[in-house]
């Protein structure tokens, strides 16, 4: 089950070719793998990557170009992801998620 995350709905508008940053607020005890998803209208949610919160390693889903996304936690309660070289097809709702067990 999804857990340990505190949602904070935000809307971001950026020009194509620019970058955007998304923040995930983590509740106490969120450790292990944190996943980033993109949900676009009319499509199933797509996992983009997952992040090992201990070693700060990023594992991209196949087909995701290296350097498109980067994520890092400067505190244990906050995870940030940057999206680079934005195109129209990057539009959608981005989610972070983690699971117990």
């Amino acid at each position: 089950k999804s857990s340990n995350l505190e949602g904070r709905t935000k809307s971001v508008i950026r020009q194509t070719g620019s970058s955007a940053e998304i923040t995930c607020d983590l509740a106490e005890g969120s450790t292990g793998y944190i996943h980033w998803y993109l949900h676009q209208e009319g499509k199933a949610p797509q996992r983009l990557l997952y992040y090992d919160s201990y070693t700060s390693s990023v594992v991209l889903e196949s087909g995701i170009s290296p350097g498109k996304y980067d994520t890092y936690g400067s505190t244990r309660k906050n995870l940030r992801m940057i999206l680079r070289n934005l195109i129209e097809n990057d539009s959608g709702v981005y989610y972070c998620a983690t699971w117990d067990g």
Epitope: E28, G29, T31, D52, S53, Y54, T55, S56, S57, V58, V59, P66, G67, Y69, D70, T71, Y72, G73, S74, T75, R76, R80, I82, R84
Partner: antibody
Framework: EVQLVESGGGLVQPGGSLRLSCAAS????????MNWVRQAPGKGLEWVSS????????YYADSVKGRFTISRDNSKNTLYLQMNSLRAEDTAVYYC?????????WGQGTLVTVSS | DIQMTQSPSSLSASVGDRVTITCQAS??????LNWYQQKPGKAPKLLIY???NLETGVPSRFSGSGSGTDFTLTISSLQPEDFATYFC?????????FGQGTKVDIK
Amino acid sequence: EVQLVESGGGLVQPGGSLRLSCAASGFTFSSYSMNWVRQAPGKGLEWVSSISSSSSYIYYADSVKGRFTISRDNSKNTLYLQMNSLRAEDTAVYYCARGGWLYDYWGQGTLVTVSS
Amino acid sequence: DIQMTQSPSSLSASVGDRVTITCQASQDISNYLNWYQQKPGKAPKLLIYDASNLETGVPSRFSGSGSGTDFTLTISSLQPEDFATYFCQQSYSTPQTFGQGTKVDIK
């Protein structure tokens, strides 16, 4: 086997510059955040700088901010630390370390001595 | 920045002794505390992460406990290879900071 090998240390005069390198092997370097940690002779450990996997997020200790620059070349599996305006208090063994909230692999270190 | 204070700074013990090292944070860091072992001329080695989780390959005689501001590393039965310096590190926020170290030597 994960290996981190630092190089580039040596003796430099105050105000001088050095560039440290850390060659990584045995893991997917481009997926990991990396760090520099230093240890002055006979002293404790001091975190110096961190860089995220694609270099988007970079952090420095206040003691080196504006003088040191961390960077990485994922195509060469190498981490760098450019050190400018060196001071006597920068004398230390410099380690590169893999990880974020924990440092699970460390190099053997390279000694930087700042002295006239 | 979060300050980490270790005690004692050094201790003498014999093989087979139970050894306890403490680490205190200047503010609440939940359980985000790691312990490292360092032998002379070598790089530090991760022993315990998030206060009580044993790193893979680390002997079970090492254990960690604590939460908030007060933490403990315990070696249940000291072995010859355990004579080293031990450091705590908070991983609650950047900059991650280390304790000053505790040197464990032979009595």
